[in-house]
């Protein structure tokens, strides 16, 4: 039975040209995280595999940085980066958990960030 839940940074906004951290956290389960995939719509951004380390999709390598932790840092943001991002946790023995983040990249210098949580 899947008992875990994914906490995410929710809806967030950031300034064009800036950076943002996409962060998900799996809680309420003792399942082992074997891999986390980060996807934007249907495009793979990155994979963090427990055994193999990070894989960053080559088309994003110049502006995606691994971490912190299982999170992902997007740099040099453009308005085209606006959209849905998904963290997909592969766990054993539970299976797959998916979290959703919506990022809005603003032209304005006043980008109000959504609520964030702290991961210890």
């Amino acid at each position: 039975m899947m008992t875990g839940t994914i906490e995410t940074t929710g809806n967030i906004s950031a300034e064009k040209g800036g950076s943002i951290i996409l962060q998900c956290h799996l809680s309420s389960t003792t399942a082992q995280v074997t891999q986390v995939n980060w996807e934007q719509q249907d495009q793979l951004l990155a994979i963090c595999n427990a055994d193999l380390g990070w894989h960053i999709s080559p088309s994003f390598k110049d502006r995606v940085a691994p971490g912190p932790g299982l999170g992902l840092t997007l740099q040099s943001l453009t308005v085209n980066d606006t959209g849905e991002y998904f963290c997909i946790y592969h766990t054993y023995p539970d299976g797959t958990y998916t979290g959703r983040i919506f990022l809005e990249v603003l032209e304005s210098s006043v980008a109000e960030h959504g609520a964030r949580f702290q991961i210890p």
Epitope: T34, Q35, L44, I47, N49, D51, L52, G53, H55, S57, P58, S59, K61, H90, Y92, G95, T96
Partner: antibody, heavy 119, light 107 residues
Framework: EVQLVQSGAEVKKPGASVKVSCKAS????????MHWVRQAPGQGLEWIGR????????KYNEKFKTRVTMTVDTSTSTAYMELSSLRSEDTAVYYC????????????WGQGTLVTVSS | DIQMTQSPSSLSASVGDRVTITCRAS??????LAWYQQKPGKAPKLLIY???TLAEGVPSRFSGSGSGTDFTLTISSLQPEDFATYYC?????????FGGGTKVEIK
């Protein structure tokens, strides 16, 4: 056109080391991890490890961890795999292979380097 | 470690035949499976990744299916150049294990 060109065949004595090179062309070398895979005569394929040419971080198969060293020279877009304390069962064709764009599979392979370990 | 088991280990077929090769993982690997073709004295060539995505330049007669533990490579109409050994590989966990191979020979 993506190409991975490996160094020539080697004959080594047991206990020695071998260093195989893999020169990449046709793509941005630092954007793709490089893997090494070997194949003993008449046998299947066995993964040795991977190296990130950008950060030089590496991950090795536990089986080879104490004997393998992977390095890169970004100025020449060349990856190297050194295996030490060679034994007869290390006789194999060694391949470099580029990591795919969407995961840890191998989309381009070198032609292979035969390493023979014999006394 | 996850083990990959291919069957059959060899098969004989004729040009034009439909050929199916299976690969079984010892536990759930989702869709993280690749297929390679290898001809004697040559390096392997990627055919399929993520269980069903055809690699660039691979003819459409090759197809992959399956998820979880059971996977299939199908060649819809075997061509002379398809006689080779085929390997499956789990591509999301150390030590990135390969199956033992399936040799497709001419009948």
């Amino acid at each position: 056109e993506v190409q991975l060109v490996q160094s020539g065949a080697e004959v080594k004595k047991p206990g020695a080391s071998v260093k195989v090179s893999c020169k990449a062309s046709g793509y941005t070398f630092t954007n793709y991890w490089m893997h090494w895979v070997r194949q003993a005569p008449g046998q299947g394929l066995e993964w040795i490890g991977r190296i990130d040419p950008d950060s030089t971080g590496s991950k090795y198969n536990e089986k080879f961890k104490t004997r393998v060293t992977m390095t890169v020279d970004t100025s020449t877009s060349t990856a190297y795999m050194e295996l030490s304390s060679l034994r007869s069962e290390d006789t194999a064709v060694y391949y470099c292979a580029r990591e795919g764009a969407y995961g840890y599979y191998f989309d381009y392979w070198g032609q292979g380097t035969l390493v023979t370990v014999s006394s | 470690d996850i083990q990959m088991t291919q069957s059959p280990s060899s098969l004989s077929a004729s040009v034009g035949d439909r050929v199916t090769i299976t690969c079984r993982a010892s536990e759930n690997i989702y869709s993280y499976l690749a297929w390679y073709q290898q001809k004697p004295g040559k390096a392997p060539k990627l055919l399929i990744y993520n269980a069903r995505t055809l690699a660039e330049g691979v003819p459409s007669r090759f197809s992959g299916s399956g998820s979880g533990t059971d996977f299939t490579l199908t060649i819809s109409s075997l061509q002379p150049e398809d006689f080779a050994t085929y390997y499956c590989q789990y591509h999301s966990g150390s030590p990135l294990p390969f199956g033992g191979g399936t040799k497709v020979e001419i009948k």
